[in-house]
């Protein structure tokens, strides 16, 4: 695993503890909360970040639902179980033995049950819609400039290949960024769209996860783009399984 060697810190994850105890005295960084060694040349998985965040919990996220299959993160923060690669385990349980199934971004996709609940596989979130509202500006942003700037941002800040940024829609003051990444499209080493969306969300809220990189300074042709609200919708490769009772509530 890689990390800054000069002062032994993790550029891509400030929620780590680093020490020069790796092979050959190299700097090695471990995520808070889990102790899992992280690769500091790329984004840390959301599961490990959530686990680290539980040591200093903040306001929970609330997401909304654009259609019948999109998921809402109504449950807020929880202390997740991560697999050895740092991905969410398909089944999550709390301390009172209440369990539920989650998708690859850790959002609940079934009703809550008990310890007998089975979650056969981790279902991939393959389509993420980031819905932003920007603060009033003198005029609307030029759509193609905005599109190029957001694609550049996801490439250069989060190392997400532009092929995974399916579209950028704009109707002042609403900006929608569509991220798409099927299981078959994601190669080894590719940043996961869920992780990129989570880093972006934290950046927009002024809670950057990067170490010493400075906060997000989004500008379109020199004009600051200031976000005043963010909603994120998640769509899974397999639709979620909720009871009719929940759907009609």
């Amino acid at each position: 695993h890689t990390a800054a060697q000069d002062n032994c810190t993790c550029p891509t994850n400030k929620m780590t503890v680093c020490s020069p105890d790796g092979p050959g005295g190299r700097c090695q960084c471990r995520a808070l909360g889990s102790g899992v060694a992280v690769d500091c040349s790329t984004l840390t998985s959301e599961c490990l970040l959530l686990k680290a965040r539980m040591s200093a919990p903040k306001n929970a996220r609330t997401l909304v639902r654009p259609n019948e299959h999109a998921l809402v993160d109504n449950d807020g923060l929880y202390d997740p179980d991560c697999d050895p690669e740092g991905r969410f385990k398909a089944r999550q349980c709390n301390q009172t033995s209440v369990c539920w199934c989650v998708n690859s971004v850790g959002v609940r996709r079934t009703d809550k049950g008990d310890l007998s609940l089975r979650c056969d596989e981790l279902v991939r979130t393959h389509h993420i819609l980031i819905d932003l509202r920007h603060r009033p500006t003198a005029g609307a942003f030029n759509h193609s400039d905005l599109d190029a700037e957001l694609r550049r941002l996801f490439r250069e800040r989060y190392r997400l290949h532009p092929k995974f940024v399916a579209a950028v829609h704009y109707e002042q003051p609403t900006i929608q960024i569509e991220l798409r990444q099927n299981t078959s499209q994601k190669a080894a080493g590719d940043v996961d769209i869920g992780d990129a969306a989570y880093y972006f969300e934290r950046d927009v809220k002024g809670e950057s996860l990067f170490q010493g990189r400075g906060g997000l300074d989004l500008r379109v042709r020199g004009e600051p783009l200031q976000v005043e609200r963010t909603l994120i919708y998640y769509l899974d490769e397999i639709p979620p399984k909720f009871s009719m009772k929940r759907l009609t509530a």
């Epitope: 890689t2 790329t42 490439r155 250069e156 800040r157 532009p162």
Partner: antibody
């Protein structure tokens, strides 16, 4: 086999515009790669100029950004470089290259074309 | 911008020698580093990417290592075809692409 071939005038006058084209064969310009220009002044090291993605996204070296334009022509499977307000310091071997990865490292290169800036 | 510094600038060695070229980055670049070989009058050729991954078709006597700010290119047993100039290149995501100044490997 991926091949890149630079073409364009070998002599440009000071304050003029340097224009080069890179023809790509063995790969589609619309593949998920980056298409870059790199230059090398005589007897010196390599300098990245900038790159383009098939959708038109560009990224330029900040030291040259105000003078550089890179464009792509998908119908001809080629991309181009324009560098304006040239001086003798822009005399160099100009290479086009295919960039792999999210941020580019260069796995295929053209053979290069020498551009001299002189009156 | 991230500065890349190679050492030595010139290296004299003999066929069969084990040689090492070092590249230092002015700040951490993770493992986003590539190595190239360039012969006079020719375009550079990719040898190593992501600090230690060998490009397809490159002989296994070439290897790369390092992370963060310090990297090395090693040629385990120098062959006559290996005398050339070698460049490192960083492709970290938050800085324009930059190359080292080059290391000339010459026959002793």
């Amino acid at each position: 086999q991926v091949q890149l071939q630079e073409s364009g005038p070998g002599l440009v006058k000071p304050s003029g515009t340097l224009s080069l084209t890179c023809a790509v064969s063995g790969d589609s310009i619309s593949s998920h790669n980056w298409w870059s220009w790199v230059r090398q002044p005589p007897g010196k090291g390599l300098e990245w100029i900038g790159e383009i993605y098939h959708s038109g996204i560009t990224s330029y070296n900040p030291s040259l950004k105000s003078r550089v334009t890179i464009s792509v022509d998908k119908s001809k499977n080629q991309f181009s470089l324009k560098l304006n307000s040239v001086t003798a310091a822009d005399t160099a071997m100009y290479y086009c290259a295919r960039g792999s990865g999210v941020i580019s490292y260069f796995d295929y290169w053209g053979q290069g074309t020498l551009v001299t800036v002189s009156s | 911008d991230i500065q890349m510094t190679q050492s030595p600038s010139t290296l004299s060695a003999s066929v069969g020698d084990r040689v090492t070229i070092t590249c230092r980055a002015s700040q951490s670049i993770g493992n986003w580093l590539a190595w190239y070989q360039q012969k006079p009058g020719k375009a550079p050729k990719l040898l190593i990417y992501k600090a230690s991954s060998l490009e397809s078709g490159v002989p296994s006597r070439f290897s790369g290592s390092g992370s963060g700010t310090e990297f090395t290119l090693t040629i385990s047993s120098l062959q006559p075809d290996d005398f050339a100039t070698y460049y490192c290149q960083q492709y970290d995501s938050y800085s324009p692409i930059t190359f080292g100044q080059g290391t000339r490997l010459e026959i002793k």
